[in-house]
Interface confidence: low
């Protein structure tokens, strides 16, 4: 703020994103006659009025008036930090401070400690680590939409003493839903202006097989011919499918994929088929019960899991 | 050293019932899936029912489904195998095995560490 002093000159605090530019400006009411100038923490000259003091490409002279100063600073490194000092040369000095903050970007997170081919109800834990923030960055957690609490995020200094590495471990039981589903860490950081850094991990999930028993043409008739479809889910795929008739000598014969063929419907036909599916994670049996006599078959609300 | 101990097997009367235990000492194996198999004298081992880690999933052989049920206690690092209603061509020695891996196998190719096994005779 401007003082009861006029040749008082007043500046700024700046923030800047490390690589980024930023711009030093100082002003003054009354300046007698006098010039302003710019020096760097290290008390070495930048700029004395229009004047470049230091071969540094990166400093440019934005504005020189009597009553403005202002350079720039681009591609600004962490090393480049620090109190800035604007000075006009009256009877006596008189300074003004700007502290410039160089922020520190994070990079892009590395998840690890992911094992492939969880089980359903298996419990995972990912580690996900950022390094050179400053100040030290959050990660936060997702399943898809959905958010993940992970442990209290862990600070560590960088060896060049001004960054951090931060890391966070997160735990959670698997479920089948989970197949497929992206496991994604976030870093959020003042640098990144809302920008989105993350990396995602996808899970694999093996469970144990369903399956479902699916009539094609949906109302068959005596005479038809009837295709019953044994469609079975899981992780692997269900690779083997037995059909059982209640009551018939197991098992029954496939002749297409996974389905049943009856290639002319009668009333023998009629009865209670299961159908299993079968993967290296387990079995399942689905029934459907066929009526001939009916117009179309009733499927069964019953289901077996082995 | 990896050792699976049955236990449970006796002499039993058509219609009677066993329980048959499965202890593992040197690993845990509570994330392991684990089966029971059976031979016969002068037949080959066969699968009779195998679990996964957690008891979520079963399997059973034809032959066993109805009859026997297969459960584990985790914090014992024990699989049972509770048979009812047995027949003499139950008669055999009884295997409890585990897999060196978390993948169940319904097949005795998929295992890799085997008890000694437990004698179940069946007769009046």
């Known amino acids: 703020n401007l003082s009861q002093d006029d040749s008082q000159p007043w500046t700024s605090d700046e923030t800047v994103v490390a690589g980024g530019t930023v711009v030093l400006k100082c002003q003054v009411k009354d300046h007698e006659d006098s010039s302003l100038q710019w020096s760097n923490p290290a008390q070495q000259t930048l700029y004395f009025g229009e004047k470049r003091a230091l071969r540094d490409n990166r400093i440019q002279l934005v504005s020189s008036t009597p009553h403005e100063l202002s350079i720039s600073i681009s591609n600004v490194a962490l090393a480049d930090e620090g109190e800035y000092t604007c000075s006009i040369f009256t009877m006596p000095v008189r300074t003004a401070k700007s502290l410039v903050t160089v922020l520190g970007i994070p990079q892009k997170p590395i998840i690890t400690g992911y094992k492939s081919s969880l089980r359903e109800k298996e419990t995972a834990t990912l580690n996900c680590q950022s390094s050179g923030s400053k100040p030290a960055a959050q990660l936060t957690w997702r399943k898809g939409d959905q958010e993940l609490h992970g442990d209290q995020t862990r600070i560590q200094e960088d060896p060049n003493g001004k960054t951090f590495t931060v890391s966070s471990s997160v735990s959670f039981q698997v479920t089948r839903e989970d197949d497929g589903a992206n496991i994604v860490c976030s870093v959020n950081h003042e640098s990144l202006k809302g920008a989105d850094r993350s990396t995602s991990q996808r899970i694999e999930v093996l469970y144990t097989p369903t399956a479902m028993i699916r009539p094609e043409p949906a109302h068959p008739r005596e005479g038809q011919k009837l295709l019953l479809h044994c469609e079975g889910r899981g992780n692997p795929v269900p690779q083997q499918y037995v059909w059982v008739k209640e009551g018939s000598e197991p098992p029954l014969k496939m002749t297409q994929e996974s389905a049943l063929i009856f290639p002319f419907l009668n009333k023998s036909d009629s009865g209670t088929y299961g159908c299993t599916a079968t993967s290296n994670m387990g079995s399942y049996t689905a029934y459907f019960t066929l009526n001939v006599n009916d117009p179309s078959p009733v499927p069964s609300s019953s289901s077996t899991y082995h | 050293q990896v050792q699976l101990v049955e236990s449970g097997g006796g002499l039993v009367q058509p219609g009677g019932s066993l329980r048959l235990s499965c202890a593992a000492s040197?690993?845990?194996?509570?994330?392991?899936?684990r089966g029971w198999f059976r031979q016969a004298p002068g037949k080959e081992r066969e699968f009779v029912a195998a679990?996964?880690?957690?008891?979520?999933?079963?399997n059973y052989a034809d032959s066993a489904k109805g009859r026997f049920t297969i459960s584990r206690d985790n914090a014992k690092n024990t699989v049972y195998l509770q048979m009812n209603s047995l027949k003499p061509g139950d008669t055999a020695v009884y295997y409890c095995?585990?897999?060196?891996?978390?993948?169940?196998?319904?097949?005795?190719?998929?295992?890799?560490?085997w008890g000694q096994g437990t004698q179940v005779t069946v007769s009046s």
């Open positions: 095995a585990a897999p060196a891996s978390r993948r169940p196998s319904w097949d005795a190719d998929g295992y890799d560490y």
């Open positions: 679990i996964d880690y957690s008891g979520g999933s079963t």
């Open positions: 040197g690993r845990t194996f509570s994330n392991y899936a």
